[in-house]
Structures are given as C-alpha cells and as structure tokens.
Interface confidence: low
C-alpha cells in the first residue's frame, strides 16, 4: 500500500522540513520562517512554538522540530511539553492562591513546589519521635523505649520521600 | 483564542504615575485570576501583583507595595496596574498574564500579552 499511495501521490515524497505546496503542482517547497514539518509528506507546516513572558526558550524552532520551551527562574514547568509555568515556593512552603504560605504546624514541605504534607506518625509504626519535624522537614523516628536494650539498633532511617500530594498512609 | 493586550506604558519622571491597562478577549475574563509581571532590561521576570476573579483577594510584590494598585472591571473586561510613586528601578516591559483556574500561581502558555514597556528616567 505504502509504495502504491507512493506512486499516486507525490506529496509522500517530500522530507520533513519541507511541505507538499499545492500552489506549484505540489512541489516539496521548504517550511517558511517560524515554521516545521516533523514528519514527511506534510500539506502545511506548523507554526512554531513562541516562548515569551514567563517561558522561555529551551530549544530553537528548526524546520523539523518545533521549539521547546522551560520557565523563567523563580517558576517550574507543569503539564505536558511544559505547557504552564508554576511559581516556586521556598522549602517549608506551599503554593496557595494568595502567593506562597508558611506550612502549617505538623506538616512539612522539602521542596520549592508541591504541598505541605503532614510529619510521620511514628506512634502508628510503634516508635517514638527520635528528631522534631519542622517546616522543612519531616520527623525521624526513633526506637520505641521499649526497643532500647544493649544490642538493638538505635535509629530507623527515614521512610523514602513521598512524592508531591502524597499524604501518607 | 486568549488575547491579551497591554497599554498605557511610556517615558515618565521619577516620582511620576502611569496607569496600565489590559484588554482581555477569547476567554470568560471573570472567571480567572489575573496578575502583572514585569521584565527590567538584562534581568529577569519578576512577579509584580495578582487580583482574584471577583477583585476581592489581591496580592503584591514587597518591591511595589503601597506604590502600585492593581484593579479589574469584569464588565469591560479589562486588567488595570496605577503606578505611583515610579522609581528607575521600576523601568521594564510589564505583561498581564491569566492564571490557569485549576493551579494556583500557574500561568498557562497561552495566557500572555506582548507586552509594555516603562521608562523612567529624568
């Protein structure tokens, strides 16, 4: 099928970064300024992404690809291909809609987005808090008294971070 | 589509007011937050201000507060920045820029004017 369609329509022939211009007996007429064609065979070239205001430039549009962009410093990408810029928070922070707010007591944030997310209940695992949490950080839990006889080891490490939004369970 | 178009920007004195405005189109402009940021030359883009859909929650960079107030009028569809007390620091490009409604503190790539640009200088 591929070779028929091939033979029928000289459209199938023209490469990415050119398009089938109909206007010239549908001669592989290269793609215009600001524009691509990323795969072959194309009637029309795509317009180019434009980076402006908080997004900026990661990569150059080129007849073939279309121009990737990131965010400003102070922002992180959300969505696909970067599609929204987020304001960054500082660590002990979350977003809100009237700008970045301390996180409450008894919940933590260790990163300049997502959510404050509540401390560890280490009394649910049967330990003790060994270190306070803060803002910033979560508690680490220690032994239990009861745990603490000569031999037993002195410190669990800290559960693996949770990501983003996550409570714990 | 989301069309956004700044005006009122142009060369005034230190100590001097300038009144921004930003007409919205292609969008139901009461439903979103809304927010002003400006770009100084050589540097980067800095947060200016935010008002809430309804103008009742509004927020400000340290750097401008008790200097700039921002407004709406969602019946003209229209975003407002009233500059005083301008200092040269305050030279920039000054965007308007719709916040996603779902993410707060969120600008969506469509979501941007071209721009306008403040001189002041004696």
């Known amino acids: 099928f591929e070779r028929t369609r091939s033979l029928q329509d000289p459209c199938s022939n023209c490469p990415a970064g050119t398009f089938c211009d109909n206007n010239r007996n549908q001669i592989c007429s290269p793609c215009p300024p600001n524009s691509f064609s990323s795969a072959g065979g194309q009637r029309t070239c795509d317009i180019c992404r434009q980076c402006k205001g908080v997004f900026r430039t990661r990569k150059e549009c080129s007849s073939t690809s279309n121009a990737e962009c990131d965010c400003t410093p102070g922002f992180h990408c959300l969505g696909a291909g970067c599609s929204m810029c987020e304001q960054d928070c500082k660590q002990g922070q979350e977003l809100t809609k009237k700008g970045c707010k301390d996180c409450c007591f008894g919940t933590f944030n260790d990163q300049k987005r997502g959510i404050c997310r509540p401390w560890t209940n280490c009394s649910l695992d049967g330990k003790s808090v060994l270190v306070n949490g803060t803002k910033e950080r979560d508690v680490v839990c220690g032994p239990s008294p009861a745990d603490l006889s000569p031999g037993a080891s002195s410190v669990t490490p800290p559960a693996p971070a949770r990501e983003p939004g996550h409570s714990p369970q | 589509q989301v069309q956004l178009v700044e005006s009122g920007g142009g060369l005034v004195k230190p100590g001097g007011s300038l009144r921004l405005s930003c007409a919205a189109s292609?969008?139901?402009?009461?439903?979103?937050?809304m927010s002003w940021f400006r770009q100084a030359p050589g540097k980067g883009l800095e947060w200016v201000s935010h008002?809430?859909?309804?103008?009742?929650?509004?927020d400000y960079a340290d750097s401008v507060k008790g200097r700039f107030t921002i407004s709406r009028d969602n019946a003209k569809n229209s975003l407002y920045l009233q500059m005083n007390s301008l200092r040269a620091e305050d030279t920039a490009v000054y965007y308007c820029?719709?916040?996603?409604?779902?993410?707060?503190?969120?600008?969506?790539?469509?979501?941007w004017g071209q721009g306008t640009l403040v001189t002041v200088s004696s």
């Open positions: 820029a719709r916040e996603d409604p779902r993410l707060s503190g969120t600008i969506d790539f469509d979501s």
């Open positions: 008002i809430s859909s309804s103008g009742s929650s509004i």
């Open positions: 292609g969008f139901i402009f009461s439903d979103y937050y």
